[in-house]
């Protein structure tokens, strides 16, 4: 049976250019992690595995980091990267737990600033 | 438990647009996943159509992105396939399914069959 | 695309034998790669996930292995409800892609 509960930071906003650190923490289980997953819907970004460490995506090598744990560091933000993140926690004897981060990237305030007073 | 059912003509002329409907029960279209069509001609393998997700996105394989629109009802939980312009190659059993993240293709319809002919 | 070739194509095995199926990814999709069973007129059935997970109710006669570009399916005692097709698939990126399956035959 499973009884764990995956935690997230769930909606969260960062600026354009700048970065964020992808959080997700799986309690109230004594299961195993084997792997833990990073993926958006049509893509995976990275995987921790208990064996073979860290791989992440070609797609995102430039600008994603592991960590901090089992965690993700996004840098370099786009407005591109919008969107809903996942990590999946593969474990043992439990199975598959799923939490599910949203992230807005706002245009900085310092752009915004220059775009609002702009000289005509 | 989650039931998909596709449904939809079996025969389609060549160069008209081929429709299907999945009918979803057990589980809410808007609440989670992926919502997936997958093609498989007969006697031969697997190819993926592309998805509607939860919150309404879509993705397409390019190799059918100018032919393919895939949409939803909410409130019949139900969404739907459209492929323009087919020919004999479009002939195949057309099957709706949920992917989740990080496991792949867990629950299908059982498959209904298109053929594609004058 | 990333392309996923299987081999063989098919094969004939006794009850009670193990048997093998390769799946090769055209670069590196790390873990992400899923097995299905598919018996003649039904729609395939998930077995394996992540390359190594088996899904929930699939006997342990079933597994999976392998990371990066090579990936192994294994029963490990073929039983005559075996016989289907089996697809492996990467879920690594879209296109979703499939291997082109492997017949599995009772010698």
């Known amino acids: 049976m499973m009884t764990g509960t995956i935690e997230t930071t769930g909606n969260i906003s960062a600026e354009k250019g700048g970065s964020i650190i992808l959080q997700c923490h799986l309690s109230s289980t004594t299961a195993q992690v084997t792997q833990v997953n990073w993926e958006q819907q049509d893509q995976l970004l990275a995987i921790c595995n208990a064996d073979l460490g860290w791989h992440i995506s070609p797609s995102f090598k430039d600008r994603v980091a592991p960590g901090p744990g089992l965690g993700l560091t996004l840098q370099s933000l786009t407005v591109n990267d919008t969107g809903e993140y996942f990590c999946i926690y593969h474990t043992y004897p439990d199975g598959t737990y799923t939490g599910r981060i949203f992230l807005e990237v706002l245009e900085s305030s310092v752009a915004e600033h220059g775009a609002r007073f702009q000289i005509p | 438990q989650v039931q998909l059912q596709e449904s939809g003509p079996g025969l389609v002329k060549p160069s008209e647009t081929l429709s299907l409907t999945c009918a979803v029960s057990g589980y809410s279209i808007t609440s989670d996943y992926a919502w997936n069509w997958i093609r498989q001609p007969p006697g031969k393998g697997l190819e993926w159509i592309g998805y509607?997700?939860?919150?309404?996105?879509?993705s397409y394989n390019p190799s059918l992105r100018s032919r393919v629109t895939i949409s939803r009802d909410t409130s019949k939980n139900q969404f739907f396939l459209k492929l323009s312009s087919v020919t004999a190659a479009d002939t195949a059993v057309y099957y709706c399914?949920?992917?989740?993240?990080?496991?792949?293709?867990?629950?299908w319809g059982q498959g209904t069959l298109v053929t594609v002919s004058s | 695309d990333i392309q996923m070739t299987q081999s063989p194509s098919s094969l004939s095995a006794s009850v009670g034998d193990r048997v093998t199926i390769t799946c090769k990814a055209s670069?590196?999709?790390?873990?992400?790669v899923a097995w299905y069973q598919q018996k003649p007129g039904k729609a395939p059935k998930l077995l394996i996930y992540?390359?190594?997970y088996r899904y929930t109710g699939v006997p342990s006669r079933f597994s999976g292995s392998g990371s990066g570009t090579d990936f192994t399916f294994t029963i490990s005692s073929l039983q005559p409800e075996d016989i289907a097709t089996y697809y492996c698939?990467?879920?690594?990126?879209?296109?979703?892609?499939f291997g082109q399956g492997t017949k599995v035959e009772i010698k």
């Open positions: 992540s390359a190594s």
């Open positions: 399914a949920r992917r989740q993240v990080g496991l792949g293709f867990a629950y």
């Open positions: 509607i997700s939860y919150s309404g996105s879509t």
């Open positions: 698939q990467q879920h690594y990126s879209t296109p979703w892609t």
């Open positions: 670069q590196d999709v790390s873990t992400a």
